[in-house]
Each structure stands twice: as structure tokens, then as C-alpha cells.
Interface confidence: medium
């Protein structure tokens, strides 16, 4: 069963190395857990960054993960990932599975292209 | 690091809902275990439909799986999706993970569109 | 191969408690969901309770709720049934279950089964 | 009473043909959900049969058969044999009792 998952299509990281972009899914389904995955594209290549599991009592996701985060509400997820650097450009998509009760629903976003720029290195300052 | 999966584009389930297809990579590199993933994609949606390790001692996986079967050899994997129903036609990609000893290999097939046309039913014979 | 081994039945009086225990192998039990499914004796088969494969989500049936409680330790491979206030109608064999959810749940595998005796 | 309706009983004589109904309502197999069979023999732990309305699990005889229409589903055994006296179940999930339901089980017996 398929479920329509919604992200931004570009996001630039901050100049700390920091992206933040929405995740929403329809329909919302009477669901009490909910598995967030986000992947890299390069190529034919489907890396997995993160991933984490939002029930109604735990909605701050990826405490496993230094470099994402995300907080659950309803059908939203807002997703960080921190830590980027220039080679880390690329398409990150969200995978949402409504996990429990069944029927088992799965939807994939089209991603999110993030571009991250390697800010210059601060001259020394004696 | 990537690799280079193949697999056949197109591939008809027989009358009784079973597809094979052949999954082979590139280069071989030298693997004491392999994973490979069958996804299925539909639309922008990607679900995982059954995954194994394989190793030198262990060339037949998806043991725990009822509707997948596969045996690996060399740098070849033979699969073979069972229990298909018309609605199951899609894309189907190989992903396979040299997973040990480093480094690290992944590489996923442009995958094979298998159809699946539903038998007739039999009438009923007393 | 998957294999579920329940252990903690036995013989209790009404109103007392008991602990079941389904330990795992053969599969990544954190995956799954994991339910319990008892038999009365002669009876047929009555599905107790359920719980996701993080330990997030619960559920019960209404004939235990308030009374038994699902739990998991995902680094023990063991799932675990409390049950208090226990009552002659439940005296039964008490099956673990494990769930498939790849293209949709059903109960794949089943252990052999625990008897729970409630009398006095 | 279980939420979904079997027949208590069913018989049939070795090689015959017998069908066990399945019967339940808009809030487990109406509302979509897919039903599963297990067999249960003498003593023994249930074993899952048919799953998916249809398909068999490796390992079980193509002389069983499953199928699904609206709110019931039925188990088709063909070329009955003296090994399938068992009970066997139905089951789906039900989404207004948040769980799991089973049929009462139908007892069959081979004759002869």
C-alpha cells in the first residue's frame, strides 16, 4: 500500500553545514508508529543517512545519529541534518513507512536536492 | 565506492505468479559476504520486498522470507519472486552491498519491470 | 531458521500473576512486531496482544486489558506477557507469534506454546 | 463467538474436494484486509497454511487453496487426505478492535 510523501525540492545547508527541510505524507492513516528513513541518491547508488521511529509518545527522532534530527507531528516530520560539507551535496530522499497497526503503508519523496557550499576558511587572528 | 549491477529490463511472471531473473555485478572484488535487496518501485515510492547476506558457506538466502528464493554464485545471483498477483507488476531493483572486508561496496540495478497478469479462475469441478 | 521458545506457564491461583517469556532467534527481532495468541483448552484460537518491533505501540484484547501487559528487550530477543489478576477463563496455552509486514502482516511463525493453568 | 464464522465442522472422504468458509465483516476482510489460514494438527502449535487470501507458503501441497470476495474467504482442499485432520483457522486483522481475529475453527475430518 503506497502512501504520497512531499518534500521541498531544493534546500541550500547553511554556511554551518546545516539543512532543515519538511517531510509530510497523506493520506495520514490511523497510525501509532511511524519509520522515517532518509537516503542519499548518487547515481544508481540509495545510501541510508538516518533513519528512526516516531510513535505518539516519542516524537523527537534520530538520537542515534550526530548528524540528524527531527521532530513528528502528525503527518509532518522536520528533518536536520548537520555536519555537511561540499561533498555531501546531493538528492536526500524521505522514506515514510506507516509501520503498526497493519495494513503496512510505504511512500518515498521525489527528495531533496541539497546544495552545501565549504565556507572559507578564517584567516588566523593573532 | 560503487558498483555495477545488471539485470535483465523486462521479465513475465509465469501462470502461477513466479518471476527469476538473473542479478549480476561488477566488478567481483573479492567478498566474503554479499547483501543483496530486492526493492520494488512504484511511482516515487521505493519498498524493500526482501533482503539476505550472502557468504561463501551460505549461497542460498531469503530463508526467511515465503515469496523470495535466490542462490548466489560468484558475482551472480539467481532470484525468484513467488506468489505474485497482477497488482504486484512493477519495477523490481537489485541492490547489492559488498559488505565484508572493506571497503565498502553498493551498487543497485536499473531494474527489471516484471508483469504479472493474473490467471483465470478455474471453474469449479465437483 | 526462525525459532520462538516460550517459557513461565504453570499452575496459579485466581487472582494471581505470572510472566511469559518467547525467546528469539534466527531473525532481526527488532524488525518485527510480536504478538500473543492463546487456546483454551479444546477451544479455539484467541489473539491476546501485540507489540510493535521498537516497543512503541501496544495492543490488547478487551478480555486482558488493564490486566496483562506486552513488553519486549530488543537486546535480549525476548518478548514478555505480565499477567495479573489472572482468571479461570484464562488458563490456556499461550503461543508467541511473530508478524511479517514486507507486503502486508499476517503471523508467519508460532512457538509451540506455554500452558497457563489458573485454579484454585 | 469469533469474530469471523467458520463451520464448526466439515468431512470429506480421501480424494474428495472439501471447501471451509470464512465469513466476516466490514471491519476485517471488508475493509480490505487480507486473510490467512493455519492449519492446526493433533497437539501441535498452529501452522501458518495460506497467507494473502491466496498464496501458499513453500513447503505446503498446491491441493490447498485460498480465495477472498467481499466480506468472506474460503480454504479449498483437494485430494483429501488422511494427514489434513486438523483444525483450521481463519484470520485477519480487524481495524475497530485494533487486532488480530480468528475464526472458531473447523474441525475436519477425514472419513474412511
Known amino acids: 500500500e503506497a502512501i504520497q510523501v512531499t518534500q521541498p525540492s531544493v534546500v541550500l545547508a547553511s554556511s554551518h553545514g546545516v539543512a532543515s527541510f519538511p517531510c509530510e505524507y497523506s493520506p495520514s492513516h490511523n497510525t501509532d508508529e511511524v519509520r522515517v528513513t532518509v537516503l542519499r541518491q548518487t547515481n544508481d547508488q540509495m545510501t541510508e543517512v538516518c533513519a528512526t521511529t516516531f510513535t505518539e509518545k516519542n516524537t523527537v527522532g534520530f538520537l542515534d545519529y550526530p548528524f540528524c534530527s527531527g521532530t513528528f507531528n502528525e503527518s509532518r516530520v522536520n528533518l536536520t541534518i548537520q555536519g555537511l560539507r561540499a561533498v555531501d551535496t546531493g538528492l536526500y530522499l524521505c522514506k515514510v513507512e506507516l509501520m503498526y497497526p497493519p495494513p503496512y503503508f510505504v511512500g518515498m519523496g521525489n527528495g531533496t536536492q541539497i546544495y552545501v557550499i565549504d565556507p572559507e576558511p578564517c584567516p588566523d587572528s593573532d | 565506492e560503487a558498483i555495477q549491477v545488471t539485470q535483465p529490463s523486462v521479465v513475465l511472471a509465469s501462470s502461477h505468479g513466479v518471476a527469476s531473473f538473473p542479478c549480476e555485478y561488477s566488478p567481483s572484488h573479492n567478498t566474503d559476504e554479499v547483501r543483496v535487496t530486492v526493492l520494488r518501485q512504484t511511482n516515487d515510492q521505493m519498498t524493500e520486498v526482501c533482503a539476505t547476506t550472502f557468504t561463501e558457506k551460505n549461497t542460498v538466502g531469503f530463508l526467511d522470507y515465503p515469496f523470495c528464493s535466490g542462490t548466489f554464485n560468484e558475482s551472480r545471483v539467481n532470484l525468484t519472486i513467488q506468489g505474485l498477483r497482477a497488482v504486484d507488476t512493477g519495477l523490481y531493483l537489485c541492490k547489492v552491498e559488498l559488505m565484508y572486508p572493506p571497503p565498502y561496496f553498493v551498487g543497485m540495478g536499473n531494474g527489471t519491470q516484471i508483469y504479472v497478469i493474473d490467471p483465470e479462475p478455474c471453474p469449479d469441478s465437483d | 531458521e526462525v525459532q520462538l521458545l516460550e517459557s513461565g506457564g504453570g499452575l496459579v491461583q485466581p487472582g494471581g500473576s505470572l510472566r511469559l517469556s518467547c525467546a528469539a532467534s534466527g531473525f532481526t527481532f527488532s524488525s518485527y512486531s510480536m504478538n500473543w495468541v492463546r487456546q483454551a483448552p479444546g477451544k479455539g484460537l484467541e489473539w491476546v496482544s501485540a507489540i510493535s518491533g521498537s516497543g512503541g505501540s501496544t495492543y490488547y484484547a478487551d478480555s486482558v486489558k488493564g490486566r496483562f501487559t506486552i513488553s519486549r528487550d530488543n537486546s535480549k530477543n525476548t518478548l514478555y506477557l505480565q499477567m495479573n489478576s489472572l482468571r479461570a477463563e484464562d488458563t490456556a496455552v499461550y503461543y508467541c507469534?511473530?508478524?511479517?509486514?514486507?507486503?502486508?502482516?499476517?503471523?508467519?511463525?508460532w512457538g509451540q506454546g506455554t500452558l497457563v493453568t489458573v485454579s484454585s | 463467538q469469533s469474530v469471523l464464522t467458520q463451520p464448526p465442522s466439515a468431512s470429506g472422504t480421501p480424494g474428495q474436494r472439501v471447501t471451509i468458509s470464512c465469513t466476516g465483516s466490514s471491519s476485517n476482510i471488508g475493509a480490505g484486509y487480507d486473510v490467512h489460514w493455519y492449519q492446526q494438527l493433533p497437539g501441535t502449535a498452529p501452522k501458518l497454511l495460506i497467507y494473502?487470501?491466496?498464496q501458499r507458503p513453500s513447503g505446503v501441497p498446491d491441493r490447498f487453496s485460498g480465495s477472498k470476495s467481499g466480506t468472506s474467504a474460503s480454504l479449498a482442499i483437494s485430494g483429501l487426505r488422511s494427514e489434513d485432520e486438523a483444525d483450521y483457522y481463519c484470520?485477519?486483522?480487524?481495524?475497530?478492535?485494533?487486532?488480530?481475529?480468528f475464526g472458531g475453527g473447523t474441525k475436519l475430518t477425514v472419513l474412511g
Open positions: 494473502r487470501n491466496n
Open positions: 484470520a485477519a486483522w480487524d481495524d475497530s478492535l485494533n487486532g488480530w481475529v
Open positions: 507469534a511473530r508478524d511479517r509486514v514486507e507486503m502486508n502482516q499476517w503471523l508467519a511463525d
